[in-house]
Amino acid sequence: QGGAAEGVQIQIIYFNLETVQVTWNASKYSRTNLTFHYRFNGDEAYDQCTNYLLQEGHTSGCLLDAEQRDDILYFSIRNGTHPVFTASRWMVYYLKPSSPKHVRFSWHQDAVTVTCSDLSYGDLLYEVQYRSPFDTEWQSKQENTCNVTIEGLDAEKCYSFWVRVKAMEDVYGPDTYPSDWSEVTCWQRGEIRDACAETPTPPKPKLSK
């Protein structure tokens, strides 16, 4: 996502509208402590980063507190006083929502409703992926709110579930990041399990009356 200037590649991640992480990869300056200077308003003076990320003892990024900033980030990566990369970006296009919290499962016969706390901002998709040991791939269902009902499940099978949040591409564009997945939880017959057996257990024979 970062255009190269003097061989500098940048990556921006805006964590849940709270923290911006800008990292750089500059082969030409691999043994140099580049400095990061930023502002949130085009007519302010630049501030220098106070929270650097280090790689092999050298600066490789900066973490900025940007809680609920509705802004453009103006920044300059410098070698001493010499700018090696200068740019400005709307931060929102690099959004990474936080992982779903308070995930709950409500079972009713062959269906489960997965809920979690909606984030404070909109235009998001809440995606639930699930599979049983019989499935070769994860199945997926997503909704605009964290209230996702999955039907047609087999009550006898054990299912693994996890949930994540994605920014809608039509609104936020292609450069956002999905949230980290929630922890995997396993369910069988409406009850939580430690794990689902990796090899599917053969179905119990039906007893004739």
């Epitope: 509208l17 085009g42 509705d70 400005s88 970006r89 709307w90 929102v92 296009y93 901002y121």
Partner: antibody
Framework: QVQLVQSGAEVKKPGASVKVSCKAS????????ISWLRQAPGQGLEWMGW????????RYAQGFTGRFVFSLDTSVSTAYLQISSLKAEDTAVYYC??????????????????WGQGTLVTVSS | DIQMTQSPSSLSASVGDRVTITCRAS??????LAWYQQKPGQPPKLLIY???TRASGVPDRFSGTGSGTDFTLTISSLQAEDVAVYYC????????FGQGTKLEIK
């Protein structure tokens, strides 16, 4: 439906001030940011900046600080642009435009779906 | 600033023609590009965003392509009502517009 209705044309003398209004309807005013843009006669479009209608926080583009002030009256769903110490080169059509997609909780991001009809400000002695 | 350069600055074509307008950004803007149509005495109208997504209600004869620095707006079959000035606009950072392309009917 979403509408942005601007105040009428103004003729001002150099050094005077002008205040252009932009009344929004058809949506919750505080949900989307309002940008101001200008178009000098026969020229292209320039973005002047935007105001977050949720926080009231204005942001000015380079070249539009000092004499230009964005303000709001959320009780009447109206945004204002005030220009002081007018110069001949301020003669232009001024537009308000609503961010089309990104809500104010998140920010503005420069895609203008809804526009006012424009207000011509003429500065002449 | 990110400079946006449009070409041509004006063009004349016949009804039914395929028309192409190009826009070049001074730096990589990925797909953060919009196209607007402005008719005389009217505000601009959003046609395309994300370089290729048609805005609601825009006829499908309008299409956009491109990413990075080079972008194209195509009108597949020109109609009389398409006479207007067309602007590209980047929104990677604070918005900047191309100088416009004036489209006329022969």
């Amino acid at each position: 439906q979403v509408q942005l209705v601007q105040s009428g044309a103004e003729v001002k003398k150099p050094g005077a001030s002008v205040k252009v209004s932009c009344k929004a309807s058809g949506y919750t005013f505080t949900t989307y940011g309002i940008s101001w843009l200008r178009q000098a006669p026969g020229q292209g479009l320039e973005w002047m900046g935007w105001v977050n209608t949720n926080t009231g926080n204005p942001r000015y583009a380079q070249g539009f600080t000092g004499r230009f002030v964005f303000s709001l009256d959320t009780s009447v769903s109206t945004a204002y642009l005030q220009i002081s110490s007018l110069k001949a080169e301020d003669t232009a059509v001024y537009y308000c435009a609503r961010e089309g997609f990104i809500t104010t909780v998140v920010g503005a991001a420069g895609r203008f779906v809804y526009w006012g009809q424009g207000t011509l400000v003429t500065v002449s002695s | 600033d990110i400079q946006m350069t449009q070409s041509p600055s004006s063009l004349s074509a016949s009804v039914g023609d395929r028309v192409t307008i190009t826009c070049r950004a001074s730096q990589d803007i990925h797909t953060r590009l919009a196209w607007y149509q402005q008719k005389p005495g009217q505000p601009p109208k959003l046609l395309i965003y994300w370089a290729s997504t048609r805005a609601s209600g825009v006829p499908d004869r309008f299409s956009g392509t491109g990413s990075g620095t080079d972008f194209t707006l195509t009108i597949s079959s020109l109609q009389a009502e398409d006479v207007a000035v067309y602007y590209c606009q980047q929104y990677s950072t604070y918005p900047t517009f191309g100088q416009g392309t004036k489209l006329e009917i022969k």
